[in-house]
Structure formats: C-alpha cells, structure tokens
Interface confidence: low
C-alpha cells in the first residue's frame, strides 16, 4: 500500500521537510502532489512525468518545492501556512490511480520570552502579584520556574490564561524568586531572563546580640540589633525607656553596675510603616553567671579505717564563690572527725572510719549560679585482726 511519511513531522519555521513515499508501484506514468487531503487541480503543487523526467509546477507551487524521481517532495524554508495535509496521486500504467495522504506541522522558532508584572514591589502578606509571560503565541506551552525549579503545589500559586499568567496570592518574603517563564513547542523552547520580586516586609521582632545577659564591671558593652526587614530597618536604642541613639549598634565602654537595666532596640520600616521592639536585660555584676565545674581530688582514695586520714580538695578558678561538700547526698561536715579549711576548699577526715566510705562531691556556687564536681569514691579497708598466740589455727 502506498504511504507517505513526513521527515520531520514537526518542522521549525524556516527549515525544510521531506515528504517520503513508501511502496511506490512499478510501471508508472507519473505522479502529482496536491495541497490538502484530496486531489484538487487548483491546489496542485507539482506534477512529474516519468517518461520525460519533467516536473511541471501547479497552481499551488511556491517555488520552494522539489520533486524527486522516487516521488518524494522536498519543501524548503517552510512557513506556518505550510502546515497541513499533502496528497500524492500516483498514475499507474494500467491507468489505475493510487492516493496517499500525509501531513506535517510547522511551528515557529520561539523568541526569548519576557515576564511582565503588575506589581514588582509588593508588601508581604498583603499584596498579590500577577506575572504574565510575553508574547502570547499559538500552539505554545507555558511553563514557570521558581528558583530554577518547577512550580510547587501551593494554594497561593494560581495559573490562568492558558498558564501564561502566574498569580501569587498574598506574597511572602520568601517569594522573591527568581521567576522565569519558559515557552515550548515541539520544535523549540526558550526561557526568559529571571525576574525577582522586591517584597517589602518587616521589620520582624529584632534580635539583640550577643545573647549574654551578664557582664563584668569594666567590660565594654557592645550590642547589635538586627530585624529582618525590606527595606532595611532603621534602628534606635533606649536604655530603661530613655532614648539613646539612632544606630544599629550600641557601644558603652567601661560599664559599671549602673549600666544594668533594660536595653530596648526599636526597629522601624518606613515603607511598611511597621515597627517592632525587643528588650534585653543587661546585668553588670562581679558574679560569674556560669560557674565552672570544680575539680575534686583526694590525698588517697583507699584508706585504712581507724588509722589513716584523708584530705579532699575542691578546686575552682572562679572568684566570689562559696563551696559546700556532700557525702551520700548529705551536707558535710557530719561528724567531729570532719573539718573544713581554706575557705571550705579542703575537707579533712581524721581518722577515717568504715562509715566514711562512699561517694563525695563538692559544689561551688554564687547567688546566681552553681556547679558540682564529678563524684569521687573513698574506699575504707580494715586490716585482719592478728591471732592472739601468733600461731595458725590448728
């Protein structure tokens, strides 16, 4: 059976297409190509006579067509108007005609698209933004990309107008993009330049850093305030409710206890008209807000009961602290044999008795913090009693 095949089926505008013929019969007079799905002399493109090997152009010939002896038809520099059906009529020697119809589709080479927006400076949680991919073209698929990824499923994202328009409902600061639109057809694809949104937002609740609350007298107090905001926030500082300065950073050298108090950072966004504050408590004190873990040492950890004495020492680098001792969860000293010395840093047990065996630890503390050492184990042994007569039992 006579058939035709388009190579390629989808053709880019300006390119060429070859209408191939398969199963061409023997003993032919000639053949003729027509535009359309039927034989119509008014739409004849070209006729070819085998005997004379002569091609005769028809009414529908544009000068871009070439017919080959094998009946294939080459059309060059195709336009979108060339899209459609083409019919080949073969005139056999027995004057019986055969026909075959094929088709192809011409698509334009797509231009680089661009994105238009109805609002490039939206306000967070308030405005919606509609992006439109230009130009509008037929037989084109519109795709959208956010941050180089295809659109996520989200109730805030809506596509309309044949996917040519992307609407962001109630934009957030995370919707800055970049946004790209891509147009596709079977023969080409092109992507726009990225577009970003300048989302106005904030300020958020400011953060004051560093997070330290406690400072030693004589230190420099350097506080920095930051609030997420677009455009960037304007900052001001208040100390105990009194305005100090309009800067993002506050520096007070050589602080004293009088600098203790509440430090307020005020952040303002002149575009959104919003402002937020954060208050940080600063406490200037000689006391260490975090007492380091003390170390506990024993003059010996295995002693002989009723004979040996032992000294336990609690070591710390912190100043302005107190020390207390514990044994089996009981506060020490608990007997006259236990003595504390050197500001409670040393616990002496003299003499050691069986009931002194067990776990000891010390704790260092000041009015705002405390820490305790790892436990230390004291073992108490008793020597075996000597035989009265010095002889082994018989």
């Amino acid at each position: 059976q006579l058939t035709t095949e388009s190579m390629p089926f989808n053709v880019a505008e300006g390119k060429e297409v070859l209408l191939l013929v398969h199963n061409l019969p023997q003993q032919l007079f000639g053949y003729s190509w027509y535009k359309g799905e039927r034989v119509d002399g008014n739409r004849q493109i070209v006729g070819y006579a085998i005997g004379t090997q002569q091609a005769t152009p028809g009414p529908a010939n544009s000068g871009r067509e070439t017919i080959y002896p094998n009946a294939s038809l080459l059309i060059q520099n195709v336009t979108q108007n060339d899209t459609g059906f083409y019919t080949l009529q073969v005139i056999k020697s027995d004057l019986v005609n055969e026909e075959a119809t094929g088709q192809f589709h011409v698509y334009p080479e797509l231009p680089k698209p661009s994105i238009s927006s109805n609002n490039s400076n939206p306000v967070e949680d308030k405005d919606a933004v509609a992006f439109t991919c230009e130009p509008e073209t037929q037989d084109t698929t519109y795709l959208w990309w956010i941050n180089n990824q295809s659109l996520p499923v989200s109730p805030r994202l809506q596509l309309s107008n044949g996917n040519r328009t992307l609407t962001l409902l109630s934009v957030t600061r995370n919707d800055t993009g970049p946004y790209e639109c891509e147009i596709q057809n079977p023969v080409s694809a092109n992507r726009s330049d990225p577009v970003t949104l300048n989302v106005t937002y904030g300020p958020d609740t400011p953060t004051i850093s560093p997070s330290d609350t406690y400072y030693r007298p004589g230190a420099n107090l350097s506080l920095s305030c930051y609030a997420a905001s677009n455009p960037p926030a304007q900052y001001s500082w208040l100390i105990n409710g009194t305005f100090q300065q309009s800067t993002q950073e506050l520096f007070i050298p050589n602080i004293t206890v009088n600098n203790s108090g509440s430090y307020t950072c005020h952040a303002n966004n002149s575009v959104t008209g919003c402002n937020r504050t954060t208050v940080k408590t600063i406490i200037v004190t000689e006391l260490s807000p975090v007492v380091a873990k003390p170390q506990i040492k024993a003059s010996k950890t295995t002693v002989t009961g009723d004979k040996d004495s032992v000294n336990l020492t609690c070591s710390t680098n912190d100043t302005g602290i107190s020390i207390r001792w514990f044994f089996k969860n009981q506060s020490l000293p608990s007997s006259e044999r236990m003595k504390l010395s050197q500001g409670n840093t040393t616990l002496s047990i003299n003499p050691v008795k069986r009931e002194d065996a067990g776990t000891y630890w010390c704790e260092v503390f000041n009015p705002i913090s405390k820490n305790q050492s790892d436990p230390i184990m004291l073992n108490v042994n008793y020597n075996a009693l000597p035989q009265e007569n010095g002889l082994s039992p018989g």
């Epitope: 004051i208 954060t278 208050v279 940080k280 408590t281 009015p367």
Partner: antibody
Framework: EVQLLESGGGLVQPGGSLRLSCAAS????????MSWVRQAPGKGLEWVAT????????YYPDSVKGRFTISRDNSKNTLYLQMNSLKAEDTAMYYC??????????????WGQGTLVTVSS | EIVLTQSPATLSLSPGERATLSCRAN?????MYWYQQKPGQAPRPWIY???NRATGVPARFSGSGSGTDYTLTISSLEPEDFAVYYC?????????FGQGTKLEIK
C-alpha cells in the same frame, strides 16, 4: 497603649461553671504569653494560669489544675479561662495579664481592670 | 513552692519620710518583681528584674536585693505613694506573690 478588657464574671453556684474572656488590643497579641491572676476580696494576689504565645503550652497551680482551662484565639486577640467545678474559695477578682518582654516574660507587665467572680449558693 | 513573706504588713509613715519594704523568700530567687495596687484598682507593675523601674514609676522608688532578701525603697514619700505593694517571684514554678505591705499615711 496596651488594652486588656475582661468579661464573663458573675454569680455562680458551687459546682457550676463560668467562662471568662479577655479582649486584647493595641499590641501584637500572638507575640506574648498571657496569664490569669486572681485576688480574693481583701486578700493578696494569686496566680491562676498561664498560656504560651502560640497556645501550645499551659500552666496551672495545684489549686485549680483539672478544674480550670486557659486557652487563646490569636485570630481574635482573645484570652479565655474556662472554670468548672467552682468552689466558694474561687470567689475573687480575676485579672487578665500580659507578660513582660519576649526575652524575659516572668512578670506581669500589663493588667486588665478585672472581672468579679462570686461563687455562692 | 517558694513562699514570699513581706514585712511589715502595715507601714505607717508621713509624706517626706523614707520607706523600706522587705520581701523575704524561703529559698533563693533570681529576681524579684514589685507591684503597686490602690483600692479599687488593678495592680500596676512597679519594679521588674529586682531593680528596674517600670514605665512611669518615679525615680524615688528603687529596688534591691539578692538571694532571699529583697527591698523596695522610697526615698521620700509623696501622697500618691500610699498603697499596697506586692512582691512576686518566678524563679521556680509556681509563680508566687507576697501577702502585701500596706503603706499608709501616719
């Protein structure tokens, strides 16, 4: 200026229930922890309940635990106190209070004017 | 729970005098807070974080203390200072209040 307006107080019999409301305005309600504090006639202040800013966490003293429930609707800027199995000793002025700063919320920085709850037969 | 004991229960002084109100805890607390309450009114925050005056509180008021002993001092009493003052802690749960000190005109 921060505004806290309590409502819902009244006379109720022992064993009865009452729901107090506190309408908040002039501040970002969802940023702040909120509490109820009560004061029996001629007596001192007693903490009743606290709820975190997002409403996830709640705290009660033993005296009301299991009987009172604090809740909030951040979309309506409203704090609630559901009081069940009321006793005579629950008679008091109930104050709605907003906590202090975000970084140190352990005090009651703003108070409403209170709503009086009387439990009596 | 931490119990706060305020003393004296009533303090009778004249305007211009110095007032010292005490709040003692049965266990060490990190900070103390003070509230002022006048008859028929809600409490008002007065001192926070032991020594910081709340908004609108005059400079004649000062707070101090540490550990278990805290003090609210009024350097020179004005007529509007006569009220009940409560201390409050929240170092550990539950938060507790003192029973109050009534400052009255002598």
């Amino acid at each position: 200026e921060v505004q806290l307006l309590e409502s819902g107080g009244g006379l109720v019999q022992p064993g009865g229930s009452l729901r107090l409301s506190c309408a908040a305005s002039e501040f970002t309600f969802s940023d702040h922890a909120m509490s109820w504090v009560r004061q029996a006639p001629g007596k001192g202040l007693e903490w009743v309940a606290t709820i975190s800013s997002g409403g996830t966490y709640t705290y009660y003293p033993d005296s009301v635990k299991g009987r009172f429930t604090i809740s909030r609707d951040n979309s309506k800027n409203t704090l609630y106190l559901q009081m069940n199995s009321l006793k005579a000793e629950d008679t008091a002025m109930y104050y709605c209070a907003r906590h202090g700063f975000d970084y140190f919320p352990y005090w009651f920085a703003h108070w409403g004017q209170g709503t009086l709850v009387t439990v009596s037969s | 729970e931490i119990v706060l004991t305020q003393s004296p229960a009533t303090l009778s002084l004249s305007p211009g005098e110095r007032a010292t109100l005490s709040c003692r805890a049965n266990s060490a607390v990190s900070y103390m807070y003070w509230y002022q309450q006048k008859p028929g009114q809600a409490p008002r925050p007065w001192i926070y974080l032991t020594s910081n005056r709340a908004t609108g509180v005059p400079a004649r008021f000062s707070g101090s203390g540490s550990g278990t002993d805290y003090t609210l001092t009024i350097s020179s009493l004005e007529p509007e200072d006569f009220a009940v003052y409560y201390c409050q802690q929240w170092t550990s749960n539950p938060p507790t209040f003192g029973q109050g000190t009534k400052l009255e005109i002598k």
